[in-house]
């Protein structure tokens, strides 16, 4: 059977401090239904960067209108990058569940490195 893939096409992205970083993520299927989230790092200590379903993420904007039913593009842009933002970012698909959504599949990750602001 066909199954959803999470594509993070860039292994690494380098951005100058103060600029915006675009992290690309695309799905290959609308099935299963459920939200996506972006995390920095992996495992139990990972940091939530963006949750499609809920929350306030003032530095994060989405490339596509994620509320659209047929959307497969979950790329994000993070503004005003600082050295503290460096790390590996994972785009993660969740399957809708009750009471909680269940992690379904993760992208391979994109490593964000931050260059010094040009003088």
């Amino acid at each position: 059977e066909d199954e959803l893939q999470v594509i993070q096409p860039e292994k690494s992205v380098s951005v100058a401090a103060g600029e915006s970083a675009t992290l690309r993520c695309a799905m290959t299927s609308l099935i299963p239904v459920g939200p996506i989230m972006w995390f920095r790092g992996a495992g139990a200590g990972r940091e939530l960067i963006y949750n499609q379903k809920e929350g306030h993420f003032p530095r994060v904007t989405t490339v596509s209108e994620l509320t659209k039913r047929n959307n497969l593009d979950f790329s994000i842009s993070i503004s005003n990058i600082t050295p503290a933002d460096a790390g590996t970012y994972y785009c993660v698909k969740f399957r809708k569940g009750s009471p909680d959504d269940v992690e379904f599949k993760s992208g391979a990750g994109t490593e964000l490195s931050v260059r010094a602001k040009p003088s």
Epitope: D2, P9, S29, L30, S64
Partner: antibody, heavy 117, light 107 residues
Framework: EVQLVESGGGLVQPGGSLRLSCAAS????????MSWVRQAPGKGLEWVSV???????YYADSVKGRFTISRDNSKNTLYLQMNSLRAEDTAVYYC???????????WGQGTMVTVSS | DIQMTQSPSSLSASVGDRVTITCQAS??????LNWYQQKPGKAPKLLIY???NLETGVPSRFSGSGSGTDFTFTISSLQPEDIATYYC?????????FGGGTKVENQ
């Protein structure tokens, strides 16, 4: 008026290359999913490739590694670079706008690509 | 890839007839299915999206139904301008895949 106009088709020898263009008007290419779909003479429709609004791309297995989809936002134009062409690539090539990749709601008139020696 | 099996491959009908075309997906695609009309030498035209929704400007004699793996497209009363080939297309999974087409001809 929302419109797509393809160009760049023609006769090419096996192993050769072509670049198809698809000029859009009435909407912004970069804000939409854009696909190429082809139709061999007397046959059905075959999807070829998509470029997402975020810039990610995806290809049918039959063209993977040979074809490249891209866009020029400043020209509001979609492209399909076709390398290592084979006889089985002979078809009318259509560009189409996808409504969030699902419904291909606007199509160009098509451009014919013939691969023959 | 998702296989889309469309039947019949061709049919003959008279003006005023009810025409029904079926499309079967090789796995569950929910209602992520579209129907297109194509006339000779022309580009396809979207008629039905999301299995049952009529595209703006399309006559109400066209309709679609179904979910999961089995879908139906109906022309309630065939008109001369409906002579064409009709395709189903799934968009639940990439690659997008089309049915083989149904050629509707005059009887």
């Amino acid at each position: 008026e929302v419109q797509l106009v393809e160009s760049g088709g023609g006769l090419v020898q096996p192993g050769g290359s072509l670049r198809l263009s698809c000029a859009a008007s009435g909407f912004t290419v970069s804000s939409n999913y854009m696909s190429w779909v082809r139709q061999a003479p007397g046959k059905g429709l075959e999807w070829v490739s998509v470029i997402y609004s975020g810039g990610s791309t995806y290809y049918a297995d039959s063209v993977k590694g040979r074809f490249t989809i891209s866009r020029d936002n400043s020209k509001n134009t979609l492209y399909l670079q076709m390398n290592s062409l084979r006889a089985e690539d002979t078809a009318v090539y259509y560009c189409a706008r996808g409504q969030y990749t699902g419904s291909l709601d606007v199509w160009g008139q098509g451009t014919m690509v013939t691969v023959s020696s | 890839d998702i296989q889309m099996t469309q039947s019949p491959s061709s049919l003959s009908a008279s003006v005023g007839d009810r025409v029904t075309i079926t499309c079967q997906a090789s796995q569950d695609i929910s209602n992520y299915l579209n129907w297109y009309q194509q006339k000779p030498g022309k580009a396809p035209k979207l008629l039905i999206y999301d299995a049952s929704n009529l595209e703006t400007g399309v006559p109400s004699r066209f309709s679609g139904s179904g979910s999961g793996t089995d879908f139906t497209f109906t022309i309630s009363s065939l008109q001369p301008e409906d002579i064409a080939t009709y395709y189903c297309q799934q968009f639940a999974f990439l690659p997008l895949t089309f049915g083989g087409g149904t050629k509707v001809e005059n009887q």
